[in-house]
Interface confidence: low
């Protein structure tokens, strides 16, 4: 192959000028013509100067993978995927996310110590003895209340998840 310059690509034993971002090669340069470049069609892109005969397919952000589109695809840049609300990234691919997972739900008896982010899952914490959380929120675990005076006996011991009344 010939040693082509940065703005050229090899075609047989010669070098042809590359097409710009957003364009692909329709026809290589010839004796009387420069490279014939054609715009990328919707749903395809090329981000750099290139000698490609076809534009690249834009990636799809699959909701089934917990993904949503954070940047639409243009003819010069691929789409970027982010996590849908309530999801965090489990597979990072360069500057975008390839797969997300729904935040963990704190179980009864646990409180949310730290809310989930785009890159981290929800962090749950067990409620200390004598406290409870029924809905697994960021609220502090609640202290169990004493039985009302008209109840003669406790129905059972309180747990961190619920209380007997």
């Amino acid at each position: 192959l010939p040693s082509c310059k940065e703005d050229e690509y090899p075609v047989g034993s010669e070098c042809c000028p590359k097409c710009g971002p957003g364009f692909h090669v329709r026809q290589a340069c010839g004796e009387q013509t420069g490279t014939v470049c054609e715009p990328c069609s919707p749903g395809t892109y090329i981000a750099h100067f290139n000698g490609l005969s076809k534009c690249l397919q834009c990636q799809m952000c699959d909701p089934a993978m917990g993904l949503r589109t954070s940047r639409n695809c243009s003819t010069t840049a691929n789409a970027l995927c982010g996590c849908s609300p309530g999801h965090f990234c489990i597979i990072q691919d360069g500057d975008h996310c390839a797969a997300c997972r729904a935040y963990a739900t704190s179980s009864p008896g646990q409180r949310v110590q730290k809310g989930g982010t785009e890159s981290q899952d929800t962090l749950c914490q067990n409620c200390p003895p004598g406290t409870f959380s029924s809905n697994g929120t960021l609220e502090e675990c609640q202290h169990g209340t004493k039985c009302s005076k008209w109840l003669v006996t406790e129905a059972g011991p309180g747990t961190s998840s619920f209380r007997w009344v």
Epitope: K5, E8, C15, E31
Partner: antibody
């Protein structure tokens, strides 16, 4: 190997025409274009025209009215004809192959054909 | 048309001397379209440097080419007797193709 062989020298009268045949070997005229360049005595090089692999031609605007370049691919021959000659057309005429290199420089040249225009 | 002006028109160099020939172009051209040819007396021109800086096959590595825009040069790092010849620059950035008037390089 690649060669371009030109027909022999000549002496022509003013207002007459000159004809040169360039016979190529080692490559096909269906793939490569052929340029014509001349060099007047004691002077530099002057591009006259080119015939492309597909048969199209481009001429130097200064000569377009009296220049004709054609070819026979099957015989690997390129034909050059210039009409209405003047003394200033006395020169060595070269055929040269258009190369597939950076910028498409002329990579192989014929040996040249000397033409003198004189009465 | 694009005019190529070479300088000097004639120069003499001693063996081992560094030599630089310049080619000034009347309007900006792409560096890929500027070439140099060597011609010795009674011989056809030979391609010498393609696309500003690419040596043709068989050209000694003491030769180099550089430039961009409207200013180009051919340099011999150490002159040798066999380098004595006339050197022409040529452009194919636009029609018609044009050549410089040549630089005749002689050896002392």
């Amino acid at each position: 190997q690649v060669q371009l062989k030109q027909s022999g020298p000549g002496l022509v009268q003013p207002s007459q025409s000159l004809s040169i045949t360039c016979t190529v070997s080692g490559f096909s005229l269906t793939t490569y274009g052929v340029h014509w360049v001349r060099q007047s005595p004691g002077k530099g090089l002057e591009w006259l025209g080119v015939i492309w692999s597909g048969g199209n031609t481009d001429y130097n605007p200064a000569f377009i009215s009296r220049l004709s370049i054609s070819k026979d691919n099957s015989k690997s021959q390129v034909f050059f004809k210039m009409n209405t000659l003047q003394a200033s057309d006395t020169a060595i005429y070269y055929c040269a192959r258009r190369g597939y290199n950076k910028g498409y420089a002329m990579d192989y040249w014929g040996q040249g054909t000397s033409f003198t225009v004189s009465s | 048309e694009i005019v190529l002006t070479q300088s000097p028109a004639l120069m003499t160099a001693s063996p081992g001397e560094k030599v630089t020939i310049t080619c000034s172009v009347s309007s900006t051209i792409s560096s890929r379209n500027l070439h140099w040819y060597q011609q010795k007396s009674e011989a056809s021109p030979k391609p010498w440097i393609y696309g500003t800086s690419n040596l043709a096959s068989g050209v000694p590595v003491r030769f180099s080419g550089s430039g961009s825009g409207t200013s180009y040069s051919l340099t011999i790092s150490s002159m040798e007797a066999e380098d004595a010849a006339t050197y022409y620059c040529q452009q194919w950035n636009s029609y018609p193709l044009t050549f410089g008037s040549g630089t005749k390089l002689e050896i002392k």
